[in-house]
């Protein structure tokens, strides 16, 4: 039975021209965490393998940095990166937890975080 | 160059242990991971699994965790695979390979290791 | 485990095609895919990452296009050096696994 929940930024704001960062977090579980895919509708970001390290998609390589810890920065943020990502865990035993976060790129100055909210 | 010199061939009796190196030269040994795969004969690749020499952290296909272990010697840029309880489906060629810079795909390999099991 | 279905097996060409080859992904793998060249004897070759990128040093008619499930591996002009088996690997989620190589002779 899969117990745990991923609680993630939730829907965030930044500047066009700014770096924000994508954070999730499993919780709930003891269920062991063997990688952890970051995903844009249907492009794949990178990938964080717990013992492997990271992949980074060419098309994302230089405006994606790795880290903090699970989390993806994005950088050189532009309007088009307005949108859905997604943070997918894979674990074992339980199998796979999806967060999500809803990213808005602001062309002005009134770009703020929304709250952190929790997806079960 | 990058280079990934691997040791010589093995004949080894069901239910002992194969220990293959995989000597890396030509990069700084701890900035890539470095997997192993096999190929049996006539038979697709098949990953066992891999190690980050940075920290020592392994993954392991489960289908071999329990008889495969992988290490490294990161002042001798050396990995190694040992596969023990061999039996005859083991027999194949054994390559190490190593992931490429922050992405997974397998950008050089060892020439190979020939591990043949038989009674 | 996610199953990679290679097709054809074995194909046979004659220098100058344009040939084809498919692979499947038992589930959706995004574009971390990559592409390989095996010669007999030989160690497999690196020739197409993330799906559609060439690798450093591989010809130009190489090719790699797809995303999700279904991938395809083009070689625009076929050379006699290309006669090999080439094979699909994704490394989308562990365990990464291979498809079954499509074998490449020249007619």
């Known amino acids: 039975m899969m117990t745990g929940t991923i609680e993630t930024t939730g829907n965030i704001s930044a500047e066009k021209g700014g770096s924000i960062i994508l954070q999730c977090h499993l919780s709930s579980t003891t269920a062991q965490v063997t990688q952890v895919n970051w995903e844009q509708q249907d492009q794949l970001l990178a990938i964080c393998n717990a013992d492997l390290g990271w992949h980074i998609s060419p098309s994302f390589k230089d405006r994606v940095a790795p880290g903090p810890g699970l989390g993806l920065t994005l950088q050189s943020l532009t309007v088009n990166d307005t949108g859905e990502y997604f943070c997918i865990y894979h674990t074992y035993p339980d199998g796979t937890y999806t967060g999500r976060i809803f990213l808005e790129v602001l062309e002005s100055s009134v770009a703020e975080h929304g709250a952190r909210f929790q997806i079960p | 160059q990058v280079q990934l010199v691997q040791s010589g061939a093995e004949v080894k009796k069901p239910g002992a242990s194969v220990k293959v190196s995989c000597k890396a030269s030509?990069?700084?040994?701890?900035?890539?991971?470095m997997h192993w795969v096999r190929q049996a004969p006539g038979q697709r690749l098949e990953w066992i699994g891999g190690i980050n020499p940075n920290n020592g952290g392994t993954s392991y296909n489960q289908q071999f965790k329990g008889r495969a272990t992988l290490t490294v010697d990161t002042s001798a840029s050396t990995a190694y695979m040992e596969l023990s309880s061999l039996r005859s489906e083991d027999t194949a060629v054994y390559y190490c390979?190593?992931?490429?810079?922050?992405?997974?795909?397998?950008?050089?390999w060892g020439q190979g290791t020939t591990v043949t099991v038989s009674s | 485990d996610i199953q990679m279905t290679q097709s054809p097996s074995s194909l046979s060409a004659s220098v100058g095609d344009r040939v084809t080859i498919t692979c499947k992904a038992s589930q959706d793998v995004k574009t971390a895919l990559a592409w390989y060249q095996q010669k007999p004897g030989k160690a497999p070759k690196l020739l197409i990452y993330?799906?559609?990128y060439r690798y450093t040093g591989v010809p130009s008619r190489f090719s790699g296009s797809g995303s999700g499930t279904d991938f395809t591996f083009t070689i625009s002009s076929l050379q006699p050096e290309d006669i090999a088996t080439y094979y699909c690997?994704?490394?989308?989620?562990?365990?990464?696994?291979f498809g079954g190589g499509t074998k490449l002779e020249i007619k």
């Open positions: 993330s799906a559609s």
């Open positions: 690997h994704q490394h989308y989620t562990t365990p990464w696994t």
């Open positions: 390979t190593r992931s490429s810079y922050y992405r997974y795909d397998l950008d050089y």
């Open positions: 030509g990069y700084t040994f701890t900035e890539n991971a």
